[in-house]
Interface confidence: low
């Protein structure tokens, strides 16, 4: 009966050797793709000279296979009922799912030039930086290949800096051969309602990026949730990509390959300003760019990126305030294409399908001492790229799932 099913589910979702959950958890059976769209700047000279609106044209998708590597350093701690691990990073280019090659070129913001005056605000230092920017023939914008932009290139300006700093720049550099973690998550053995919930990340229960409760590591990593998910539940999860915990709410019921799933979506409220959603007050960490915390739809993750002026948003500034998108032309936000969702099978709590969408932006501000930026009359949050990371349970796995889980319940 129902009790037996519940007992079986509770046993099989525990993260320990021999369970269904553990096998899929160690190495996901789902093929995960990460598609990139790059924002190619159409009027770089006009922007640098006249502080015009930035005209962008998205180009993509350029698709990589990701999350194909098994978790490593898996260590069970029977005392506190946790399991720790690291998630190795890797990306393999998929030419057949892409509009071009990794050698395709794009005109994008010069990441080092934009970041330098933000990191080094002292006027004297900026004079020195300016001479190095000029000497290296760098400017506000640059042309880079997809491979360089994503995974790293040796920056000519930074290479001239006369003291030891990293001279390699890339939106995701370093990525291949790195790991995310250490994650320590509850294995659910003593309390199934905590299964997969993150106990600590990199040895800490908080991030040290945000003030107050915004700094908490809440929920799971979104690959699964504690079982018996109800529509009224808010699903909380931590995303290292955006350096924060976030949440999803029930949106609709979906049939996924014959399996009834709940589609949970990230609500606009999660990206709201503190005026609209007071809970977000501690995600507003600076007053100028945020117009005294009234702007919304962008998240300053600079503290998590060694002080670099990195801002995360939804693609095309979906759910962002007009002041954020106004200086950029060529954006067309669309709820269906640009929102993030998780399709969760409610009995097991497994995420059987998902689409994680986010946009990486860099803040560039006027800098009087740096010629490449001195003509700017306003700050811009410049879109660099947006990504769509998706995974769907395979047909074979779906059949197996129906037989073992949903079929038995019917």
């Amino acid at each position: 009966g129902d009790m037996l099913i519940e007992k079986t589910i509770k046993r099989e979702v525990v993260l320990e050797e021999g369970t269904t959950a553990f096998k899929n958890w160690v190495k996901t059976g789902t093929t995960v793709y990460r598609q990139f769209w790059i924002f190619d700047v159409q009027n770089p000279d006009d922007v640098a000279k006249n502080s015009s609106k930035i005209k962008v044209k998205q180009r993509g998708p350029y698709t990589y296979r990701v999350r194909y590597l098994a978790k490593e350093n898996i260590t069970q701690d029977p005392e506190d009922h946790t399991v720790s691990f690291v998630q190795p990073n890797g990306a393999i280019f998929e030419p057949s799912l892409s509009v071009g090659t990794e050698d395709d070129n794009f005109t994008v913001l010069n990441l080092a030039v934009a970041a330098a005056p933000h990191i080094y605000q002292n006027s004297f230092v900026q004079v020195v930086l300016n001479s190095l920017i000029k000497k290296s023939k760098s400017s506000m914008f640059q042309t880079r290949s997809l491979k360089e932009l994503l995974w790293g290139y040796k920056d000519p300006f930074l290479s001239l800096v006369p003291y030891p700093i990293s001279t390699t720049v890339g939106v995701f550099y370093p990525y291949n051969d790195t790991v995310d973690g250490v994650y320590k998550v509850f294995n659910g053995k003593d309390n199934i309602s905590k299964v997969a919930i993150i106990e600590s990340y990199k040895g800490k229960r908080n991030l040290s990026y945000w003030p107050s409760y915004c700094d908490m590591i809440n929920g799971t990593d979104a690959a699964s949730f504690p079982p018996f998910v109800e529509k009224s539940r808010t699903l909380r999860f931590f995303s290292s990509d955006i350096c924060r915990s976030i949440y999803a709410v029930f949106g609709s019921e979906i049939d996924l390959k014959g399996i009834p799933v709940y589609r949970f979506v990230l609500p606009a409220n999660a990206f709201a300003s503190p005026l609209q959603n007071p809970d977000n007050h501690c995600f507003c960490t600076e007053k100028v760019i945020s117009n005294n915390c009234t702007s919304y739809g962008v998240l300053d993750i600079g503290k998590c990126k060694e002080g670099k002026p990195v801002y995360i948003s939804l693609p095309h500034f979906l759910h962002a305030s007009p002041d954020v998108s106004e200086p950029i032309e060529g954006l067309h936000p669309n709820e269906d294409e640009h929102r993030t969702y998780l399709d969760v099978e409610p009995i097991t709590g497994f995420t059987l399908q998902f689409a994680k969408r986010l946009q990486v932006n860099i803040l560039v501000k006027p800098a009087r001492k740096i010629e490449a930026l001195k003509n700017l009359k306003r700050p811009y949050i410049v879109p660099i790229l947006w990504l769509n990371e998706t995974g769907t349970i395979g047909d074979e796995k779906a059949e197996m799932f129906k037989t073992q889980v949903t079929g038995k319940i019917k």
Epitope: K194, E199, S200, S208, D215, M216, R236
Partner: antibody, heavy 129, light 105 residues
Framework: AVTLDESGGGLQTPGGALSLVCKAS????????MGWVRQAPGKGLEWVAG????????AYGSAVKGRATISRDNGQSTVRLQLSNLRAEDTGVYYC??????????????????????WGHGTEVIVSS | ALTQPSSVSASPGETVKITCSGS????YGWYQQKSPGSALVTVI????NRPSSIPSRFSGSTSGSTGTLTITGVRADDEAVYFC???????????FGAGTTLTVL
Amino acid sequence: AVTLDESGGGLQTPGGALSLVCKASGFDFSSYAMGWVRQAPGKGLEWVAGKAKDGGGTAYGSAVKGRATISRDNGQSTVRLQLSNLRAEDTGVYYCAKSAYGDWFYGSSGPYADSIDAWGHGTEVIVSS
Amino acid sequence: ALTQPSSVSASPGETVKITCSGSSDSWYGWYQQKSPGSALVTVIYDSTNRPSSIPSRFSGSTSGSTGTLTITGVRADDEAVYFCGSFDSSTDSTAFGAGTTLTVL
């Protein structure tokens, strides 16, 4: 079994300073965050101070901020609370508290008081002239 | 602040629920004190975790911003003041409830 023994309480004079020590045993002291919580006579509990396992993260309650210093010695399995410029309202029982984790949840004013899994018996402090 | 009822009472064998309301979704700890100034005992931490020395009749749960301590089959020696502890996002500080006195009739 986990044991937390506080010492250093007693009669103190206003404006003076006190030093409380908590000696821990029965667990790997260097793996857990430790803290102090106090209770004024006939009142509820109040967070005083906390320190992460490695001595890195520190959090003080608003009533003692600027007057309190928490330190720990992992070799000796002790955690010390020093409180200066004592006031009458510092009177109460001071409890040593162990977190179930290596760190407290930090807010800008203090940690979450949800993960205390063991307490000392308390040491009484009376601030009076 | 965290809000708790000042007192609850029950007869032996009954189930008692003590609630604690915070200002946002949170985790809760529950701490037992048999007399003022005496030792504190953790009966629940992290909303649902029970220390190994605590009998299974003590359990904890959370729903939204409210934490609940449930004592199933209450006994005379459960008579005590129960404090909840968490974080109060409205004041941005660590918080304890004022305590709930459990009387076993």
